[in-house]
């Protein structure tokens, strides 16, 4: 279809003002999913920078899908006249930040982080490995970015950018990824292999982000982390295609080439990694 063949031109900072996304899923393309229902839904279009209508098939898809235009605007637009900034000039936290810590019904002893609304801080807890709720982050940094207030009355957002309380502008934060490349795959691809806590010796693969290859390791059968794949192909599909070469401060170079969508499950949402 046309999406597969479209030409991706280089977009640099000078061509468009930087897009200030409130949530990373607002950047996802509208996805009608594989089912055949005809349901009117709304998505945020990063090109027009507006919420628009689309037809949803009724299953799967992604998080850039809203029941109403108002809900879409609330989640994805930064309309200064009708900001979601509280009177304290802080960006509103997602609802799930206020959910209590939930280890879930399984017991895998996995270290995760949650936002404690009593202490107003992100804290460590032991996650069981299944179910639970969305107040559950792989890293302390991710939890702080999404749920904690910054030191100067700003809310840190998902893109490693801060909403400045004074002029309502976005200030980019430093990233640990080398400047030549930007990683757009799942965050767990950057974590080290983790054998886990049990005593089995299962053959698994992990993505070694230093050498950029999938390597075998022995998995204990429980615990560990998400950089854990049953086959090398699965590992490569999920992680290898996540690096995009940067060519300028804000532009990504993308080659004109047929690409297929590869669905990757990440924590509580589905993201799409484009095969380069």
């Amino acid at each position: 279809d046309s999406e597969e063949d479209e030409e991706h031109t280089i977009i640099t900072d000078t061509e468009l003002p930087p897009l200030k996304l409130m949530h990373s899923f607002c950047a996802f393309k509208a996805d009608d999913g594989p089912c055949k229902a005809i349901m009117k839904r709304f998505f945020f279009n990063i090109f027009t920078r507006q919420c628009e209508e689309f037809i949803y098939g009724g299953c799967e898809g992604n998080q850039n899908r809203f029941e109403s235009l108002e809900e879409c605007k609330k989640m994805c637009t930064r309309d200064n006249a009708n900001r979601i900034i509280k009177t304290t000039l802080q960006q509103e936290k997602p609802d799930f930040c206020f959910l209590e810590e939930d280890p879930g019904i399984c017991r895998g002893y996995i270290t995760r982080y949650f936002y404690n609304n009593q202490t107003k801080q992100c804290e460590r807890f032991k996650y069981g490995g299944c179910l639970g709720n969305m107040n559950n982050f792989e890293t302390l940094e991710e939890c702080k970015n999404i749920c904690e207030d910054g030191p100067n009355g700003f809310q840190v957002d998902n893109y490693g950018t801060q909403l400045n309380a004074v002029n309502n502008s976005l200030t980019p934060q430093s990233t640990k990824v080398p400047s030549l490349f930007e990683f757009h795959g799942p965050s767990w691809c950057l974590t080290p292999a983790d054998r886990g806590l049990c005593r089995a010796n299962e053959n698994r693969f992990y993505y070694n982000s230093v050498i950029g290859k999938c390597r075998p390791f022995k998995y204990s059968g429980c615990g560990g982390n998400e950089n854990n794949f049953t086959s090398k192909q699965e590992c490569l599909r999920a992680c290898k295609k996540g690096f995009i070469q940067r060519i300028s401060k804000g532009g990504l170079i993308k080659t004109k080439r047929k690409r297929k969508k590869q669905r990757v499950k990440i924590a509580y949402e589905e993201i799409f990694v484009k095969n380069m």
Epitope: P103, I105, C106, R107, G108, G128, C222, G224, N225
Partner: antibody
Framework: QVQLQQSGPGLVKPSQTLSLTCAIS??????????WSWIRQSPGRGLEWLGI?????????RYAVSVKSRITINPDTSKNQFSLQLNSVTPEDTAVYYC?????????????WGQGTLVTVSS | DIVMTQSPLSLPVTPGEPASISCRSS???????????LNWYLQKPGQSPQLLIY???NRASGVPDRFSGSGSGTDFTLKISRVEAEDVGVYYC?????????FGQGTKVEIK
């Protein structure tokens, strides 16, 4: 060997409260390696999960949205049992009700079930 | 809710022959740590369900090795290598990827 023994009335009138109890032997309702659930089965709906409780650092519960406004699952640690209360029942709630243990450690699944109680909602 | 769809709904089998049941989920169940959040249960006539396969492919204790589970993503299969008379009943798949926990509608296995 874990055993779950269900008890409670088999007939409930519409608008009344359905109450069932599940007595546990061979495990503890407060165990941090288990969770305790109610599931019902009817010809129209098949197996339908209703809710679950579990003790970790504290007690947690989760309920199916379809019954959330009407359901309560409570542990009774003194009697080592847990109960189901479903308020404002209608004939749609007629089903065989099962209590089940979710194995939280290695075997993540409902590995032990009660014998089932047929509850009929009728005046 | 995640919808679990099984096929076939009825499966007449011959003892000693293999049998296969399919289960499809409306969204991917393979998530963290290489774990598949899918179980299989068998409900024999007049009995409560019993756990057969957990985490997609692991046999529960006491389950004969003629039962095997496989699959990933949204497509899963339960196989019986050689059906025995005691295997008759209704087989259910169940997901625990997200609340509410949901079951397939069941596949009734009966002897021809």
């Amino acid at each position: 060997q874990v055993q779950l023994q269900q008890s409670g009335p088999g007939l409930v009138k519409p608008s009344q409260t359905l109450s069932l109890t599940c007595a546990i032997s061979g495990d503890s309702v407060s165990s941090n390696s288990a969770a305790w659930s109610w599931i019902r089965q009817s010809p129209g709906r098949g197996l339908e999960w209703l809710g679950i409780i579990y003790k970790r650092s504290k007690w947690y519960n989760r309920y199916a949205v379809s019954v959330k406004s009407r359901i309560t699952i409570n542990p009774d640690t003194s009697k080592n049992q847990f109960s189901l209360q479903l308020n404002s029942v209608t004939p749609e709630d007629t089903a065989v009700y099962y209590c089940a243990r979710w194995h939280s450690d290695k075997m993540w699944g409902f590995d032990d079930w009660g014998q089932g109680t047929l509850v009929t909602v009728s005046s | 809710d995640i919808v679990m769809t099984q096929s076939p709904l009825s499966l007449p089998v011959t003892p000693g022959e293999p049998a296969s049941i399919s289960c499809r989920s409306s969204q991917s169940l393979v998530m963290s740590f290489g774990i598949t959040y899918l179980n299989w249960y068998l409900q024999k006539p007049g009995q409560s369900p019993q756990l057969l396969i957990y985490k997609g492919s692991n046999r529960a204790s006491g389950v004969p090795d003629r039962f095997s589970g496989s699959g990933s993503g949204t497509d899963f299969t339960l196989k019986i290598s050689r059906v025995e008379a005691e295997d008759v009943g209704v087989y259910y798949c169940q997901q625990y990827d997200s609340y509410p926990l949901t079951f397939g509608q069941g596949t009734k296995v009966e002897i021809k």
